[in-house]
């Protein structure tokens, strides 16, 4: 058999600074099994070095000196007896860039440098970023383990140092943030914030970092109801809104959460399976009615829980007045005034702009009030005839406004015809 020296190794390999690379390699050399069996030694040298004197970059020969700058970083991987010359390069440095050749030695007969198959190593600037691993989604209040690792890095070389930064880490002690792993208990306010892992090789200038935006899943913590862009005050899960009867109303309910909660509006205080009157955070009423005193509920439904706020509508109305109207009856002149308002209004009668309060001590007039449904009625009885033309007014008022009406009573009962007083409003 013809003696053959062969080496199979890639011509060039590129690795980023601080990372590792494995260069597969196999070789063959002439060897007869009936020869004596001296040990097989293999070496990797820097190109241009003289094998007899030079320090090697990697070898399996314990008696050969290894270059201090590659010690522990360049290693032979695999079984050389099986003709495996694979080279592992760790914590690559810029100064490692260059050509390397492989040499085999066994006894006196086998001493060969494979100069035709050199390995060209190029170390480039580090652009690889670390990976931050954690189980998604992050859930508010649930501790989660995060780890930071650099693809392509290995144990070779000085140890890596880590530092974590981000708003979500504020309560952690500094030691915790210097490990490749940390346990984070995210809060709702951490959603959307940045978390950065920075890696550095001790004693080297090589640093790299990765920033991730935290996606924290959290149930709604609060509900806000807006009217015309203004938030309503909420006390004990209830909001109070005074609103004018007959007015159109558009309300917006907002409940920050992630993923967004499903918002809906219900009549009154609903059961859990009630039918919504709006399947969004928007409630539109073409007008508010007195019947709306029952109020509405905004519910925010979320996979992590639900929240609801009751909106208590306090419906108010300005006094609406019917009257006064007057007629002659047996006991004297009888005037009536009807009014409707929320809250219930006060009412007073005036005769020639002079207030008539209660019942007169002389018995010249009498006031009676009653209410039925939304309407209240008041009556004024004036005893005796009219000495001159008189103006009778009634006025209703509440905290939101007032309304008044008046009639002009013309002198002389005979003028009144069918008994209805001619009115000049």
């Amino acid at each position: 058999e013809k003696p053959v020296y062969e080496l199979q190794v890639q011509k060039s390999v590129t690795v980023q600074e601080g990372l590792c690379v494995l260069v597969p390699c196999s070789f063959s050399y002439p060897w007869r099994s009936w020869y004596s069996s001296p040990p097989l030694y293999v070496y990797w040298f820097r190109d241009g070095e003289i094998p007899y004197y030079a320090e090697v970059v990697a070898t399996n020969n314990p008696d050969r000196r290894v270059k201090p700058e590659t010690q522990g970083r360049f290693r032979l991987l695999g079984d050389v007896q099986k003709k495996n010359c694979s080279l592992s390069i760790g914590d690559a440095r810029m100064e490692d860039t260059g050509s390397y050749f492989f040499r085999v030695e066994r006894g006196r007969d086998v001493k060969y440098s494979y100069q035709q198959n050199k390995l060209n190593l190029e170390v480039t600037a580090l652009i690889e970023k670390p990976d931050i691993h954690f189980l998604e989604p992050l859930e508010s209040g649930r501790p989660t383990r995060l780890s930071c690792s650099l693809p392509g890095s290995c144990e070779a070389g000085p140890p890596l140092t880590f530092s974590w930064t981000g708003n979500a880490l504020s309560p952690l002690d500094p030691e915790t943030t210097r490990s490749s792993e940390l346990t984070l208990t995210p809060r709702p306010e951490d959603h959307g914030t940045n978390l950065t892992c920075q890696m550095k090789r001790q004693g080297a200038q090589v640093t790299t970092e990765r920033t991730v935006q935290l996606n924290v899943s959290y149930a709604p913590q609060t509900i806000t109801i807006f009217r015309n862009g203004i938030a309503l005050e909420i006390l004990q899960n209830t909001s109070y809104l005074p609103v004018l009867e007959g007015q159109a109303l558009r309300l917006l309910c907002d409940a920050p959460s992630n993923p967004p909660a499903h918002l809906s509006w219900f009549q009154g205080s609903p059961a859990l399976n009630a039918t919504p009157i709006s399947n969004t955070g928007i409630l539109e009423l073409r007008r508010v009615r007195s019947a709306e005193e029952g109020g509405f509920t905004c519910r925010a439904q979320h996979p992590l829980g639900f929240l609801q706020i009751f909106l208590n509508l306090s419906v108010y109305s300005l006094p609406q007045l019917l009257g006064p109207s007057c007629s002659w009856e047996a006991e004297g002149l009888h005037c009536r005034c009807s009014f409707r308002a929320r809250p219930a209004p006060s009412l007073c009668w005036r005769l020639e702009e002079k207030p008539l309060e209660g019942n007169s001590s002389q018995g010249s007039f009498k006031v009676n009030s009653s209410s039925a449904g939304p309407w209240a009625n008041s009556s004024l009885i004036l005893h005796g005839g009219l000495s001159s033309d008189l103006k009778v007014s009634c006025k209703a008022w509440n905290i939101y406004g007032s309304q008044s009406g008046s009639v002009l009573l013309l002198q002389g009962r005979s003028n009144l015809g069918t008994g209805v007083v001619p009115a000049a409003l």
Partner: antibody
Framework: QAYLQQSGPELVKPGASVKVSCKAS????????IYWVKQSHGKSLEWIGY????????NYNQRFKDKATLTVDKSSSTAFMQLNSLTSEDSAVYYC???????????????WGQGTLVTVSA | DIVMTQSPSSLAASVGEKVTMSCKSS????????????LAWYQQKPGQSPKLLIF???TRESGVPDRFTGSGSGTDFTLTISSVKAEDLAVYYC?????????FGSGTRWEIK
Amino acid sequence: QAYLQQSGPELVKPGASVKVSCKASGYSFTDYNIYWVKQSHGKSLEWIGYFDPYNGGTNYNQRFKDKATLTVDKSSSTAFMQLNSLTSEDSAVYYCAREGYGYDDREWFAYWGQGTLVTVSA
Amino acid sequence: DIVMTQSPSSLAASVGEKVTMSCKSSQSLLYSTNQMTYLAWYQQKPGQSPKLLIFWASTRESGVPDRFTGSGSGTDFTLTISSVKAEDLAVYYCHQFYSYPFTFGSGTRWEIK
């Protein structure tokens, strides 16, 4: 419980007018729109229009704009529909109906009157 | 105007059977502001006024038996009677109240087989 009571059947001559009434009870009359619907014999339903007793607002189906006039009398909680220039095509059952919740300008018909049969015949 | 197309125009089924009827609208009845579907179903028994069964496409009116179910969204809707009873003999109408003029389907008549 809301209840709508309509006036009785009418037999009218072509060219004449008729006024159908619908008396509401069991709820606050001004809080809900009253709708009117036509159903010709053996046919489907046709929306005529609505009257809003709160503010007097109306909305008509264009097909009935010149045929129907909607009014109400708030004091008696009664809605009216007057049909004019009647022809045989107007022979039908006419229903009044009340909307559901009264929140929206567009709602379903939750309560129906019993219907008034108007027959136009010479 | 929105056109409401109901099918079939009539169907025959035995008491106890499941009955399904369809209603298609010529445009979507989903109102984006409140994400509610503006469709109702009515039942009209012979000689009677229509009666509300379903509103907002799937909300059963109070007092309506739970054998009546409304479903669908957008433009395609279905009324299902899970186990039809003799008293359900009627014409069923779908109704869009999404935009004026309000319109009704031509009806589906259920007859006993």
